[in-house]
């Protein structure tokens, strides 16, 4: 049902869902701080533009009595319960920030007449693709899939002269929320990734993964997994790995690879790490000082959500347009706005675009080095290191199928 919005007469409110079930185990206090920091910036920007308006946030907390798993498994109804709470209190703002869980976002979008924009720090799953009033500020699974297919097909780089068409995917069910949906997308038989590959098998047991590492009869040399180095080591241990195995470790929201004095452990030599390019100043900013390297992006997405709302509010107010309209609700896409740490681009469907970075371990320096970057906005790969010091033979990535000649 329609809920009146606190969104007119020079006073504009943001409804922030503070859900107990969250994509990342970030203390809600940190998210509040991120939102409040965003509000300060927005107020300053509006004031500088000569717009004398009030912008505030209302934090809507879940009671946590029923939906208390802390992760996304019981989030489906929590989001709807919070919406009901907002509805009963007649406290809907101009925009809804949160939820972050794919289950809850999908259900809220499905079960409500959304005449207001939803901004999510998360909602990674394919089921949240192509939603008209949903904006996602953390890389969704679709973007990962497009990178992987692009990279698999690439065969004209000095360090990758073979097209790949096969892969193993390790997915044991203990993944974090982002990894769960990334791997879920790769596993789905109807997904773009599955459609473009000739062979793909999901490894669900540790032993399956461990056996593949030295199995002469393996059907692919490439294994995709999701997590950090510690996660890989816990699984792989000190086991020997065949020389033509390539492990692709998806670890998008982890800035540690770019920090000073980081050296790669020995077990990372057969691994390519896919991560996001860190912000220009985020590593040392006051905002991120109290956040762990894997949580920065989550809190940053909340902060950028506020800045995005401020950007759209400014445009609509300057054009003398109404905020409580379907036009406003559908406007949070196909644009670039000034984020906390530089420009943020949203695609035609409101999903954040970013620069993905593929890292390798230099056998000379034991440092992580950038092999290539990938711009999700234009679906294009840009080689960076034309003569990488790989562990692989001839400093080239091997074929994905042992013994197969040039493609």
């Amino acid at each position: 049902s329609q809920v009146s919005q606190n969104c007119h007469n020079g006073s504009y409110e943001i409804s922030v869902l503070m859900m107990g079930n969250s994509a990342f185990a970030e203390p809600l206090k940190n998210l509040e701080d991120a939102v409040n920091e965003g509000l300060e910036i927005v107020r300053g920007r509006l004031q500088n533009a000569g717009l004398n308006v009030t912008v505030n946030a209302t934090f809507m907390y879940s009671d946590g009595l029923i939906h208390n798993s802390g992760d996304c498994r019981s989030s489906t109804c929590e989001g709807l319960d919070l919406l009901r709470k907002i509805s009963n209190a007649q406290r809907m703002g101009c925009v809804l920030i949160g939820p972050s869980c794919t289950y809850s976002t999908f259900q809220m979008y499905l079960d409500t007449e959304l005449s207001y924009p939803m901004i999510s720090a998360g909602s990674f799953g394919l089921s949240c693709d192509y939603k008209e009033t949903l904006t996602r500020l953390m890389s969704p699974a679709r973007k990962l899939m497009y990178f992987l297919v692009n990279f698999w097909k690439t065969n004209d780089l000095p360090f990758k002269t073979y097209s790949w068409s096969t892969s193993y995917v390790y997915k044991n069910g203990t993944e974090t929320e982002d990894c769960f949906w990334y791997l879920n997308a790769l596993e789905a038989s109807v997904s773009y990734f599955s459609h473009e590959l000739g062979f793909k098998v999901v490894l669900r047991q540790d032993k399956e993964f461990q056996d593949i590492l030295m199995d002469h009869n393996r059907k692919s040399n490439v294994i995709i997994m999701c997590g950090g180095p510690e996660f890989l080591y816990k699984l792989k241990g000190d086991r020997a790995v065949a020389e033509d195995i390539v492990i692709i470790l998806v670890d998008l929201f982890n800035d540690q690879y770019f920090e000073d004095n980081v050296t790669a452990p020995d077990y990372m030599k057969n691994v390519l790490v896919l991560t996001l390019s860190p912000g220009n100043s985020l590593l040392n900013s006051s905002f991120s000082r109290n956040l762990s390297p894997t949580k920065r992006d989550f809190a940053l997405a909340y902060l950028n959500g506020i800045l995005l709302f401020g950007h759209m509010l400014k445009i609509f107010l300057e054009n003398g347009e109404n905020i409580t309209t379907p036009k406003f609700a559908h406007a949070f896409r196909n644009l670039t706005f000034e984020g906390y740490d530089g420009p943020v681009t949203l695609d035609d469907w409101g999903d954040v675009d970013s620069t993905m970075v593929l890292l390798y371990t230099s056998v000379d320096t034991k440092k992580y080095k950038v092999l290539l970057t990938y711009d999700t906005h234009v679906n294009k790969t840009y080689p960076v290191d034309m003569s990488p010091t790989f562990t692989w033979k001839n400093s080239k990535l091997p074929n994905d199928i042992t013994g197969r000649g040039p493609q």
Epitope: G228, P229, Y233, V262, P265
Partner: nanobody
Amino acid sequence: EVQLVESGGGLVQPGGSLRLSCAASRNIFSLYRVDWYRQAPGKQRELVAGSTSGGTTTYADAVKGRFTISTDNVKDTVYLQMNSLTPEDTAVYYCHAHDHWRDSWGQGTQVTVSS
């Protein structure tokens, strides 16, 4: 980063034994590997013995059969038991750890083997 403090060095006669200890500032089991290195005057630092949390131990050829590396996960301490010492073992012994992200080094402890 993990802090490492070595102890147990000293003067010992050829054929004697010493046990070096390296106390870590955090859970040793969370580290990828812990190692003992040594540096003799005018020489490069060299790996003496190493142990990974996966249970693999490695030794330099020169110390195999004489030195033993071990860890105590309760005390978060790494030990190097050195037997049948020779003057060639005289060096500063350093504890090293890698926590999956960074290398850390102790200040070193002097071992002198002399009659």
